[in-house]
């Protein structure tokens, strides 16, 4: 496919742009000028000037907005001001305000928790497959499949933590070294960035919204995809990670410490605990090739056990294999030695839900994921709802200047490296990046926060979940203690060297642009969020891993032509963008690939057609329900729901059924209630916040 | 009770094979070791192997490997013991013994023993 | 194989007398030394095992003390039925092997 999702025939002009996939758009074309477009790449188009770092990229049949997309919408207040309040409107209003509050922190510790049950539940359906990925003895040698297993493991458990642990307790039992332990962090550093992607796929029901907190949430995926792509060829040539941090390690003479501060565990682990418990030793242990954890459950049972170690009489194969040699005896035909166990007697039973079911862990995960999805999703809409409602006018102002604002001349710069440190700490409290980027994704949709700011955010973020885990590695026991510092100081140098690359400049600022170019394409086609998740996180990395199973030549045989076809595609860009003149007719522009591989509109037009069978119910059923069936059927009017399936029809007829973006509407309010999601009475009785 | 009934005394020329029996009752056959123990004529004690009649696993004294086969038949619950290649010195009583103290190497209960004699 | 060296080879002790046999090692051998006594004419009869249990039936005066290479083996009060050949087996390595026996007579 051609790196933008949507290729005409244009002609650059360095004056003059049009927003292709990403970046601005102050004009637009007038739509009745195109009408003789085709899928015919020799019929004449018009001609569209274009920003040469846009190349030759259009979106076909763009649907026209006024304004940039990217511009914050106008939190604008519609309801009576403080001052024109009676004292009844003012204690009334004041205890609304107070009530929403309450309701926002309640729906945002729910959001916390179902964070943290959406983790159990994936380590449940695929903690023990993540735990195999470990055992494969080919980590050592290959770093790519290193990568691909870091990626792999932290999707399937929902946890870079866990994922990390894990390698830190096998390079403390010497199955793995740090040298292949480094691409699986760096892969877990990539996996760790779903989990608010999969949040922003929430947002789906307004195009506009979910166009920002995509672009939010992928920007993350965008730092770090890109941030190994540079840095893991850098690593395996130079193993610069492995030599600071082994130089660290060794020149301080380090204590064990006290464990990381569990605040927001503290806070929601009484919940959670009562939902699932898991017993998360038994990924680790099916890592290490311990044959009896394979058939281990996950979901702890006995919460209060009894440990009594006691000697024991067992067959050893040979006498070399004996505890000592005083501890060694024979039967006449067995060797026979005294091995200490520790004898486990179970007291109580943990107090969760599943305790006494007995139900398989991937039922329990599949309950749980389901669940914890629903509840996921229906915070969400309930945290934007609030947000919505209070973020107006005067508050709406003070908070966007606040945070959106840079530092008067000439310290402008400094206030990126401040977001950057606001996110380490955020993320310091929460004990999780997930966690704080999750948090932060709904702000962006909603427009609280521009991408530009949550992009230093978001590199904050993953600088202070190494912070926790340096912290957890000063309290680890003296044999892990090395292992597990120097980890989780590779995690922390590998993610400063990313912001090196990523951020002090400007111009290298380029998860910003992707993730913004994904975010229109997202917005137009809601099915391609879903469908980059799937390749990104899962395909991509399955295909590596199997690759590098078959061994090095299929790996290089496979690989290498699919690099050389994607040099060649962002060469010939970069061509078509900043010198055409010296290609051929022909290669200055996409259009002498057939449109499938130029556009997404062919490929739309498929996945409209396996949808279709959806459409007609898809808007039939609950809000929430409602907003997951948005996302596959793409339907324009979808949060409408009453309204859904008569739209969807007239859809169908071949009328487009355009959605007015919420920013040219005075407020969120309206724009929601336009698009038939709050009752038009909501409007009149809003709050106005002090 | 547990009883180890061993096979006759034998007179066998040097080179010659000598395969005696060691009948078992009073326990099952299958649980414990049988150890085979030879004593030379005024000399001490000197084992010669182990077979275990669950599984048929044997273990033998380096002195004896190649020279003595030791089978067990469970349906009989009887052990057997060839011994091959017999020199004069082979000479003694061979006993039959169990150790019912489960992983150790301490036999307690011994059959009668069988002289065999080899003579020219 | 493991050497068991039994002494003295024999000994001659008055009804009464506390006698005591030792027997050594030529290497590490834990506690899996066992003595069995052989009464003349008769077959071997465990007395010991693990080096200081006795087995079921054996009279509280045979007592056996000892680890590593160094073991003995005590009848506190001989009794005129305790005359016999007793020896030490161990059997901390394949082969089991004996010690040469200890011959102990009544005054």
């Known amino acids: 496919m051609a790196p933008w999702p949507e290729l005409g025939d244009a002609q650059p002009n360095p004056d003059k742009y049009l927003e292709g996939a990403a970046g601005q758009q102050p004009t637009a074309p007038d739509k009745s000028k195109e009408t003789n477009k085709t899928d015919n790449t020799e019929a004449p188009v018009t001609k569209i000037e274009l920003l040469p770092s846009y190349s030759t990229a259009t979106l076909i049949d763009e649907p026209t907005e006024v304004d940039d997309p990217w511009n914050l919408p106008t939190l604008q207040d519609s309801g009576i001001k403080w001052s024109e309040r009676d004292t009844k409107g003012k204690i009334l209003c004041f205890f609304q305000g107070i009530g929403r509050l309450i309701l926002l922190l309640g729906f945002l510790y729910f959001f916390v928790c179902s964070l943290d049950i959406l983790s159990s539940a994936f380590q449940l359906v695929g903690g023990k497959m993540a735990g195999q990925f470990f055992s494969n003895s080919s980590i050592m040698s290959n770093p790519l499949l290193g990568l691909v297993i870091g990626v792999l493991v932290t999707v399937l458990v929902q946890s870079s933590s866990t994922s990390t642990s894990i390698v830190v307790s096998m390079v403390s039992s010497s199955l793995l070294t740090v040298r292949a332990a480094i691409p699986i962090i760096m892969g877990a550093n990539i996996g760790t960035s779903i989990t608010n992607t999969i949040v922003a796929l929430m947002q789906v029901g307004d195009r506009s919204e979910f166009r920002r907190a995509f672009a939010g949430a992928t920007v993350h995926d965008f730092f770090n995809w890109l941030s190994v792509l540079v840095l893991l060829p850098v690593e395996v040539a130079t193993h610069y990670l492995e030599i600071i941090t082994q130089l660290i390690v060794e020149s301080f003479h380090f204590k064990n410490g006290e464990d990381a501060p569990d605040l927001l565990k503290v806070i929601t682990k009484p919940f959670t605990k009562l939902i699932v418990q898991l017993d998360k030793k038994v990924i680790s242990q099916i890592a290490m090739n311990d044959e009896k954890a394979k058939n281990k459950s996950l979901v702890k049972i006995w919460c209060k056990t009894f440990t009594n170690k006691t000697q024991i009489n067992v067959t050893v194969p040979s006498t070399a294999n004996c505890t000592s040699p005083s501890l060694c005896w024979t039967d006449g035909i067995q060797n026979w030695t005294m091995k200490n166990v520790t004898y486990k007697e179970n007291i109580a039973k943990c107090q969760h839900i599943f305790v006494n079911f007995h139900l398989p862990d991937l039922a329990v995960g599949t309950i749980l994921l389901i669940l914890s999805l629903l509840v996921l999703c229906g915070c969400l809409i309930m945290i934007v709802k609030i947000l919505g409602s209070v973020l107006k006018g005067q508050v709406a102002t003070v908070i966007k200047k606040t945070i959106n604002t840079d530092f008067p001349f000439p310290f402008a710069w400094l206030t990126g490296y401040l977001a950057i440190l606001v996110g380490a700490g955020m993320t310091f409290i929460v004990q999780s990046s997930s966690v704080f980027t999750s948090a932060l994704t709904p702000l962006i949709g909603i427009g609280v926060i521009t991408i530009e700011r949550a992009y230093p955010l978001t590199l904050g973020s993953n600088i202070g979940t190494t912070t926790t885990a340096i912290l957890a590695a000063l309290a680890s026991p003296g044999n892990a203690l090395r292992s597990s510092l120097q980890i989780a100081l590779c995690h922390f140098f590998f993610n400063i060297s990313g912001i090196l690359l990523w951020y002090p400049i400007p111009f290298t600022r380029l998860p910003i642009r992707m993730a913004k170019g994904l975010g229109n394409i997202s917005a137009k086609y809601r099915w391609f969020a879903v469908f980059y998740l799937i390749i990104f996180f899962f395909l991509i990395p399955l295909t590596v891993f199997g690759l590098s199973l078959a061994g090095w030549r299929v790996l290089v045989g496979v690989g290498v032509p699919v690099v050389f076809i994607i040099i060649l595609v962002l060469c010939l860009r970069l061509l078509q963008s900043r010198c055409p003149r010296v290609l051929p007719k022909k290669l200055q522009n996409w259009n002498f690939l057939p449109l499938w591989m130029r556009s997404l509109k062919p490929w739309d037009a498929v996945v409209s057609k396996f949808t279709g069978c959806f459409q007609m119910r898809c808007c039939c059923c609950c809000r929430v329900c409602c907003r997951a069936c948005c996302l596959l059927c793409d339907c324009p009017k979808c949060c409408r729901c009453s309204k859904c399936c008569e739209d969807l029809e007239e859809a169908q007829e071949g009328q487009d059924v355009p959605v007015k973006a919420p920013e040219t509407f005075d407020n969120i309010t309206i724009s929601r209630e336009a698009q038939g999601e709050v009752p038009a009475s909501d409007s009149k009785t809003e709050c106005t916040a002090l | 009770q547990v009883q180890l009934v061993q096979s006759g005394a034998e007179v066998v020329k040097p080179g010659a094979s000598v395969k005696m029996s060691c009948k078992t009752s009073g326990y099952t056959f299958i649980t414990y070791n049988m150890h085979w123990v030879r004593q030379a004529p005024g000399q001490g004690l000197e084992w010669i192997g182990a077979i275990y009649p669950g599984s048929g696993d044997t273990s033998y004294n380096q002195k004896f490997k190649g020279r003595v086969t030791l089978t067990a038949d469970k349906s009989t619950s009887t052990a057997y013991m060839e011994l091959s290649s017999l020199r004069s010195e082979d000479t003694a009583v061979y006993y039959c013994?169990?150790?019912?103290?489960?992983?150790?190497?301490?036999?307690?209960?011994w059959g009668q023993g069988t002289l065999v004699t080899v003579s020219s | 194989d493991i050497q068991m060296t039994q002494s003295p080879s024999s000994l001659s002790a008055s009804v009464g007398d506390r006698v005591t046999i030792t027997c050594k090692a030529s290497?590490?051998?834990?506690?899996?030394v066992a003595w069995y006594q052989q009464k003349p004419g008769k077959v071997p009869k465990l007395l010991i095992y693990w080096t200081s249990t006795r087995h079921t039936g054996v009279p509280s005066r045979f007592s056996g003390s000892g680890s590593g290479t160094d073991f003995t083996l005590t009848i506190s009060s001989l009794q005129p039925e305790d005359v016999a050949t007793y020896y030490c087996q161990q059997y901390s390595r394949i082969p089991l092997t004996f010690g040469g026996g200890t011959k102990v007579e009544i005054k």
């Open positions: 013994s169990i150790s019912t103290i489960i992983t150790t190497g301490a036999v307690d209960y």
């Open positions: 290497q590490d051998v834990g506690t899996a």
